[in-house]
């Protein structure tokens, strides 16, 4: 016979030779690492047919790391559902508990012996301090001074000393999350108050009011022959401006087929027409306006779409 | 609290031309939204036009043609140029800061008398 | 534009009397109306503001209600200073416009 099989968990026992004569017998023993169980075989035989009888290392078993117990308020959870050195032991802690140590372990030899690379680690409960204090308002169970996971806490502003409220920007209720750190930054109370949205040749179809404080929303329309330049729709944000720009209302212009009509009083210029929020005076853009939606105006690729003069 | 003045009224041939004027003081007038409204016996009140803090305009179409508001920051005045002025142009006016960028007439000035007349 | 139309064009009251100016829109302008007092000899000043809403330092005496094209004015107790011509005026549409004002006389 050629030279034995070889084999992960078990070795030959002494050198082997190039080549066997039919009838001897070769031993093997665990590899370091490995302890033996028995009854399984651990010798082979050249057979006649210059083969060797078969053999397997299945009675060598893989050194296993000492049982870890679950940490209190967690689970260890071996990696491949086995002890055996050369695998991990992950660590997770419950919801409202966080991992102090190592969250993997290794099972390592050292010498023959299997052992876990380090100390288990423990879970400890999640607390939070107190989150932050905001200036113009306050939140629920200031007196409170540690939180655990989970506890929930819930801003609200204080009211005004001026005839408009403070408005809170950004959520209202935090809680303390994983880490120890909670969910969001604190929100913030302050004066938010948009301008009135002036729309010339248009109205405000939605959302009135005395004043626009934040998330006040407005819809507009534009008067018949003319088209709305913008959204319809505009929110206030919390820098006290509308959010998108108020829109403009421009006219809808005749085909070019026709001289257009001189202006009459009741036409405004695009030079001269401004909302509050939009910018000052600039180059005139050419308009082009999207189809009409009024009978009897032309759509725009019928006629030349000029500068608004 | 800002303080505004009307200036530059008088007498004036019909077709001729006229620059009011509204001084602020206590304040800057480049912070605030000026309105200008007048007053007539047979017309009533009418809202002119206005200008706003970013120097924007809005204008009653019925005088846009013949009126412009303007202001100069470093004077801090707001304008009102009144061209071709007719006799029913006969009125007091009055400049007027918008009640923080809210639609209402709140700090009037005592007005100024425009007279056309040939 | 939006005409307003005030009625009466003028009344005369006593002081203590409550007296009542209506204002009516030849449209709907939500309540974006405002109401002004000019007296004697001055210029006007705000009383009002969106329908209802009192300016500061306006005595408590003076109510505005409505909505749509329809608005009231009320002086619950009138007195001898509350002489002079009420105005409304509309802001939901430019341009923005006044009514032809209500003269007020105490008896």
């Known amino acids: 016979c050629e030279e034995p099989p070889t084999f992960e968990a078990m070795e030959l026992i002494g050198k082997p030779k190039p080549y066997y004569e039919i009838g001897e017998r070769v031993d093997y023993k665990c590899k370091k690492g490995y302890f033996y169980i028995p009854p399984l075989a651990t010798h082979t035989i050249c057979d006649r047919n210059h083969t060797w009888l078969p053999v397997s290392d299945d009675a060598c078993y893989r050194e296993t790391c000492p049982y870890i117990r679950d940490p209190l308020n967690g689970q260890a959870v071996p990696a491949n559902g086995t002890y055996e050195f050369g695998y991990q032991m992950h660590f997770i802690c419950n919801e409202g508990y966080y991992l102090i140590g190592e969250e993997i372990l290794y099972c390592e030899l050292k010498g023959s012996v299997a052992i876990w690379s380090g100390k288990p680690p423990i879970c400890e409960k999640v607390l939070c301090t107190p989150p932050p204090k905001i200036k113009n308002g306050k939140h629920t169970f200031s007196e409170v001074e540690v939180f655990e996971y989970l506890d929930a806490v819930t801003y609200s502003c204080d009211p005004a000393p001026g005839p408009d409220p403070f408005s809170l920007i950004g959520e209202s209720t935090i809680y303390c999350g994983d880490n120890s750190v909670w969910s969001r930054a604190a929100p913030e109370c302050k004066v938010v108050k948009c301008r009135f949205p002036v729309v010339e040749n248009g109205k405000q179809i939605s959302g009135f009011g005395k004043k626009f404080y934040y998330k006040a929303t407005v819809m507009f329309e534009c008067d018949k022959g003319f088209y709305l330049d913008g959204s319809d729709t505009i929110v206030c944000d919390s820098n006290s401006t509308w959010d998108p720009p108020v829109p403009k209302c421009l006219k809808v212009l005749p085909p070019s087929s026709t001289k257009p009509p001189a202006l009459s009083h009741s036409v405004s210029t695009s030079s001269t027409t401004k909302s509050p929020a939009s910018s000052a005076s600039g180059p005139r853009p050419t308009y082009k306006p999207p189809v009409s939606n009024y009978p009897g105006y032309p759509k725009p690729e019928e006629g030349i779409l000029d500068s608004l003069d | 609290e800002v303080q505004l003045v009307e200036s530059g009224g008088g007498l004036v041939q019909p077709g001729g031309s006229l620059r009011l004027s509204c001084a602020a003081s206590?304040?800057?007038?480049?912070?605030?939204?000026i309105s200008w409204i007048r007053q007539s016996p047979s017309r009533g009140l009418e809202w002119l036009g206005v200008i706003w803090t970013d120097g924007g305009t809005n204008y009653n179409s019925a005088f846009m043609s013949r009126f412009t508001i303007s202001r100069d920051d470093s004077k801090n005045t707001a304008y009102l140029q009144m061209n071709s002025l007719k006799t029913e142009d006969t009125a007091v006016y009055y400049c007027?800061?918008?009640?923080?960028?809210?639609?209402?007439?709140?700090?009037w000035g005592q007005g100024t008398l425009v007279t056309v007349s040939s | 534009a939006i005409q307003l139309t005030q009625s009466p064009s003028s009344l005369s009251a006593s002081v203590g009397d409550r007296v009542t100016i209506t204002c009516r829109a030849s449209q709907g302008i939500s309540n974006y109306l405002n109401w002004y007092l000019q007296k004697p000899g001055q210029s006007p000043q705000l009383l009002i503001y969106?329908?209802?809403s009192l300016f500061s330092g306006v005595p408590d005496r003076f109510s505005g209600s409505g909505s749509g094209t329809d608005f009231t004015l009320k002086i619950s107790r009138v007195e001898a200073e509350d002489v002079g011509v009420y105005y409304c005026?509309?802001?939901?549409?430019?341009?923005?416009?006044f009514g032809q004002g209500t003269k007020v006389e105490i008896k």
């Open positions: 005026q509309q802001y939901i549409k430019l341009p923005w416009t």
């Open positions: 206590g304040g800057s007038v480049s912070s605030y939204d």
């Open positions: 007027e800061r918008v009640y923080d960028g809210y639609p209402w007439f709140a700090y």
């Open positions: 969106y329908t209802s």
